[in-house]
């Protein structure tokens, strides 16, 4: 079956938006007014993954770009990156595990846990203008909660 996708933007729980920082990195910062147009629009695809009541497997691509968030080991540490893919083959229902995140949603707050590295989450720093990264702690200084805003296709 073809994969189902929705366009959306994400903001962290401090209302920081996500923008491109160079070709293969995202950063989080507060945006207002016209600057909101800078925020990245994701194509969230609902993909196959392990069955769980509270975790929905998704892939997060950048809308109209052949880039997907993926989780890989770099220097033995789980790391978030933007990975370029062949647009003829993506998105697909059976995404490779490095592209899959378990969306955990409670009261409209979302967390994105790496399927490849359980208990590692898409995270932002408290500080402004810092890279979006994969963090191994929840409830600490770093932010792992996001809100989602729908965007028209």
């Amino acid at each position: 079956a073809p994969v189902r996708s929705l366009n959306c933007t994400l903001r962290d729980s401090q209302q920081k938006s996500l923008v491109m920082s160079g070709p293969y990195e995202l950063k989080a910062l507060h945006l207002q007014g016209q600057d909101m147009e800078q925020q990245v629009v994701f194509s969230m695809s609902f993909v196959q993954g392990e069955e769980s009541n509270d975790k929905i497997p998704v892939a997060l691509g950048l809308k109209e770009k052949n880039l997907y968030l993926s989780c890989v080991l770099k220097d033995d540490k789980p790391t978030l990156q933007l990975e370029s893919v062949d647009p003829k083959n993506y998105p697909k229902k059976k995404m490779e595990k490095r592209f899959v995140f378990n969306k955990i949603e409670i009261n409209n707050k979302l967390e994105f846990e790496s399927a490849q590295f359980p208990n590692w989450y898409i995270s932002t720093s408290q500080a402004e203008n810092m890279p979006v990264f994969l963090g191994g702690t929840k409830g600490g200084q770093d932010i792992t909660d996001f809100t989602m805003q729908f965007v028209s296709s």
Partner: antibody
Framework: QVQLQQSGAELMKPGASVKISCKAT????????IEWIKQRPGHGLEWIGE????????NYNEKFKGKATISADSSSETAYMQLSSLSSEDSAVYYC?????????????WGQGTLVTVSA | DIKMTQSPSSMYASLGERVTITCKAS??????LSWFQQKPGKSPKTLIY???RLVDGVPSRFSGSASGQDYSLTISSLQYEDMGIYYC?????????FGGGTKLEIK
């Protein structure tokens, strides 16, 4: 609690159009797809299409393209389905239902149905 | 379109009996399968989604399972209020498609 309140029964002439409504209460309207389903005696249940009020995305069953037009008004938290060029084949009960935006929970809630009768 | 072949189309069963209704999908539906119950003149009521997850408030005598593309709804001990028509639905691929229904009556 969640409720989907549909508009009342309609008696229509062949060739006319009808617009039926589905008023949602008790949940975040923008985050659930509204589904439209047709039920005719002897024909079972047929899926017509869906709309996600949060972004206006619409998916139709090809069979109903040109027959059904689905819309939603977020300010009144109401979804609509217009049926055009009515014929006796369109005489049916039409239901609205909901499914969460990530498709996980199935058709969770249902309206009470709207009976459309097409007769000369 | 994905065809959902539901069987039996009708059946009689005794109170307390174990009842199983099946739906066969014509292709993979990635466990996006629901079961509904409908009583005469009423709207359908969702019992189960994603093959085996029970909707809140649905009695535990209802259960769902899958084997390949064969999906089953089981009522472990039939109660009088369980009579009605049961439908399956695949919501993996557009257009979503329903089974033809199983009319369950008390013997």
């Amino acid at each position: 609690q969640v409720q989907l309140q549909q508009s009342g029964a309609e008696l229509m002439k062949p060739g006319a159009s009808v617009k039926i409504s589905c008023k949602a209460t008790g949940y975040t309207f923008s985050r659930y797809w509204i589904e439209w389903i047709k039920q005719r005696p002897g024909h079972g249940l047929e899926w017509i299409g869906e709309i996600l009020p949060g972004n206006g995305n619409i998916n139709y069953n090809e069979k109903f393209k040109g027959k059904a037009t689905i819309s939603a008004d977020s300010s009144s938290e109401t979804a609509y389905m217009q049926l055009s060029s009515l014929s006796s084949e369109d005489s049916a009960v039409y239901y609205c239902s909901t499914i969460y935006y990530d498709y996980d929970q199935g058709f969770t809630y249902w309206g009470q149905g709207t009976l459309v009768t097409v007769s000369a | 379109d994905i065809k959902m072949t539901q069987s039996p189309s009708s059946m009689y069963a005794s109170l307390g009996e174990r009842v199983t209704i099946t739906c066969k999908a014509s292709q993979d539906i990635d466990r996006y399968l629901s079961w509904f119950q409908q009583k005469p003149g009423k709207s359908p009521k969702t019992l189960i989604y994603r093959v085996k997850r029970l909707v809140d408030g649905v009695p535990s005598r209802f259960s769902g399972s899958a084997s390949g593309q064969d999906y089953s709804l089981t009522i472990s001990s039939l109660q009088y209020e369980d009579m009605g028509i049961y439908y399956c639905l695949q919501y993996d691929e557009f257009p979503y498609t329903f089974g033809g229904g199983t009319k369950l009556e008390i013997k």
